[in-house]
Structure formats: structure tokens, C-alpha cells
Amino acid sequence: MGKGDPKKPRGKMSSYAFFVQTCREEHKKKHPDASVNFSEFSKKCSERWKTMSAKEKGKFEDMAKADKARYEREMKTYIPPKGETKKKFKDPNAPKRPPSAFFLFCSEYRPKIKGEHPGLSIGDVAKKLGEMWNNTAADDKQPYEKKAAKLKEKYEKDIAAYRAKGKPDAAKKGVVKAEKSKKKKEEEEDEEDEEDEEEEEDEEDEDEEEDDDDE
């Protein structure tokens, strides 16, 4: 699949990622033989980023903008290997995949975790939220599971309506063939949606980290 394709353009980097990369390079120059304690290093980077002014961050934001442009440019000309479909253009009008119960729970308790542990990296915040979720009695998870189920139901109705509306030429093709490919297509789209939810969660965390810094 695409993950193993050497020709596939490198993913775009956020301003914070550029900053961390710079920190790593600086650290390597100063301590070429020292091994890096990843969690300690992440914590220090996060603390440093939080104290930086908007002007100082500007350099990394420019780097991120340039990298985004590079990624978009390269993706336009990228042809995936046979057997792998090129990731579709995301229609902004398409219904958004609903959040899971855990995702809803995280939205409630992420501020507390981040507030109590300001130096924590995104990964460690997620880890703590996971522990919190695991320590929560099944009964206390119910409100989140109920809401997630409701949102999933709504999404399924919305996506069905969206697909029906958005496939005008489907009627011209053979009904049997369409039925056969429908299941495969839905499976692919579900896989893609899952990837999107992960991406969105990462982006949300990155945005939040940057928002916190701006406060």
C-alpha cells in the first residue's frame, strides 16, 4: 500500500514539528554522542514553544506554509502504484465522520489533563486520557456511548443522502455491478474515514497546543 511507496510525497509538517526538528538538530550539534530521553526532550521542547513570542514562531509557521505548498504541489502529480487508489479530494460538504465515545470523553477531560500537566506532549496527554477512560466504570461511559451512537446514526443517514445526491451518473451503469461494488466502496470509505478521524484528532491536539501557547 501507499505507506511503502518511496515515491509518495512526504507528509506536510506543522510549525511545531519544524520547531522540534530544529531543537533536535541543535541538541545533536551540542551533544553529538548523547542519547536522547524522548519524553524529557518533548517536555522541554513543549515548554520552550510555550514561552516563544508570535514573532519567534513566525519563522516556523512560514516553514510549515512552504511545506504545505510543497506537499500539495507534489500530491497533484503523484500517481499511486497499481492497486492503490489515490486518496480522493475531500469534499468539504461531505458529512463529517462522527466521533467515537472515547473521542467525546477526551473532549470533556482533555482541558483538565492539559491544565494539570502543562508540559505533557500530545502523546502523553492521549495516554493519560486512555488511562482515565480505562479507569472509568462502564456505567459512566454510557452517556458518551449513547451520544456517539446517536451521532453515528445521524451520520449514516446523512452519508446515504449525500451519496444518493452526489452520484447522478450511477444510474446509467448496470445495477448489478453497482450493487457488487457498493460494499467494497463503503469498506474503503470507512477505512478512509477512520484515517480521517485519526488525522483530525492529531490536528485538533496540535491546534489546541498552539492555541494554548497563544493565550
Epitope: E108, Y109, K112, M132, N135, P143
Partner: antibody
């Protein structure tokens, strides 16, 4: 100092309404689940209701479902309990309590309590 | 709803005594159990959470044990300020339910 201060209790006739408030201070109110717990004169403790940090999720005891509404205003650090269709059996001291969630494998605990406000339902 | 039954309902003890209060749940609640102390005219105070974890600021003479359906609160050496009513509470399911209380009185 971490503190919860209830107000709004009093004497009300059966069928009447009352709105209790709980002012929080000394901690980041918007991070915590909050609850109301009541205690009838000379009796034990009874959990009434719970609300999530954002206010998006609420739970009620069957005895108050459909009559009581829990809400919160995070900008004012205040928790509320709107009590409608009050009955004589609702007579109690109403405590507002902070709920510490999922801190350990033991789930949740009411770790901070207010001093309580007395609600008397009588004609 | 999960029923919580405490025993005894009341007990008389002297300063320095070792006191044990038990709490039984009507179904298994794992370690989802808390203990509170309440003095007359005052709000309850959390002593023990998650069956055996001591809440910060609570003297070490208080301890909790048990899991499943049977739990115990022990006061190793009763002090004058410990004369109060003690409640157990399950946090395994909604509605949260409390035991009927155990009143510890001076002998």
C-alpha cells in the same frame, strides 16, 4: 482555598419551584464533573444529579427525573439545580459536590463538598 | 440499583480502640468504593477512595480494604475527633448509592 458555597434553599409549598446555586472557588471549575447530593433530616445520603465538565452530559436519580434540572455556567463558576413540582419527600439539605473522575481504578469520588442548603417542602 | 449495606448501624468505642466498619454491595463493584465521614451539622468528608486509597490530608490511622462485594473501613486507634457517622458509597454504577451509615459513639 477550594470551596463550594450553596444558596437558594428555603420553604416552598408542594408543587412549587426552587433554584439552588453553588458557587465554586479555589479550583478550575470547568475541569470537573459536579453533583448534587441530598440528605433528608436524620437520614442518610442520596445522590441526586451529575453534570459533565462542559455541561453536555447530565444524569439524574429516578426520584427526581423529569422534575429537576442540573446545569452549570463555567464563566461564572456556578452550578445550578432547578427544582420543579416539589414534593414533601424532597425536603432535605442539598449539598453540591465536586466529582473527581477516573483518577484511579476506583472510578469517581465526591472529594469536595459544600456546607449545604436546606430545602423544606411543606404547606 | 446497587444496594449498599453497612454494619453495624452504630457502635460505642473508647479513645485508642481499633474500630472496624463493614460494607456489603448487592453485586460485585470491583474496587469502586469510597468512604466518607460526617459530623453533625457538617458536610461529608472523603476519607478513602477506590476501596483502599487514602485521600490526601486524611490521617493514616484510617485504612480501607476489600474488593468485589465486601469492604472494610478500619480506624487503628480511635481519636476524640473520629466520633462521627461513616458512609460507604459505590461509584460502579448510576445511581450512585450510599450505605445507611454507621454511627461511632463514645463509650
Amino acid at each position: 482555598e477550594v470551596q463550594l458555597l450553596e444558596s437558594g434553599g428555603g420553604l416552598v409549598q408542594p408543587g412549587g419551584s426552587l433554584r439552588l446555586s453553588c458557587a465554586a472557588s479555589g479550583f478550575t471549575f470547568s475541569w470537573y464533573d459536579m453533583s448534587w447530593v441530598r440528605q433528608a433530616p436524620g437520614k442518610g445520603l442520596e445522590w441526586v444529579s451529575r453534570i459533565s465538565p462542559s455541561g453536555g452530559y447530565t444524569m439524574y436519580a429516578d426520584s427526581v427525573k423529569g422534575r429537576f434540572t442540573i446545569s452549570r455556567d463555567n464563566s461564572k463558576n456556578t452550578l445550578y439545580l432547578q427544582m420543579n413540582s416539589l414534593r414533601a419527600e424532597d425536603t432535605a439539605v442539598y449539598y453540591c459536590a465536586r466529582l473527581e473522575v477516573g483518577a484511579t481504578s476506583g472510578g469517581t469520588a465526591f472529594d469536595i463538598w459544600g456546607q449545604g442548603t436546606m430545602v423544606t417542602v411543606s404547606s | 440499583d446497587i444496594q449498599m449495606t453497612q454494619s453495624p448501624s452504630s457502635l460505642s468505642a473508647s479513645v485508642g480502640d481499633r474500630v472496624t466498619i463493614t460494607c456489603r454491595a448487592s453485586q460485585s463493584i470491583s474496587s469502586y468504593l469510597n468512604w466518607y465521614q460526617q459530623k453533625p451539622g457538617k458536610a461529608p468528608k472523603l476519607l478513602i477512595y477506590a476501596a483502599s486509597s487514602l485521600q490526601s490530608g486524611v490521617p493514616s490511622r484510617f485504612s480501607g480494604s476489600g474488593s468485589g462485594t465486601d469492604f472494610t473501613l478500619t480506624i487503628s486507634s480511635l481519636q476524640p475527633e473520629d466520633f462521627a457517622t461513616y458512609y460507604c458509597q459505590q461509584s460502579y454504577s448510576t445511581p450512585r448509592t450510599f450505605g445507611q451509615g454507621t454511627k461511632v459513639e463514645i463509650k
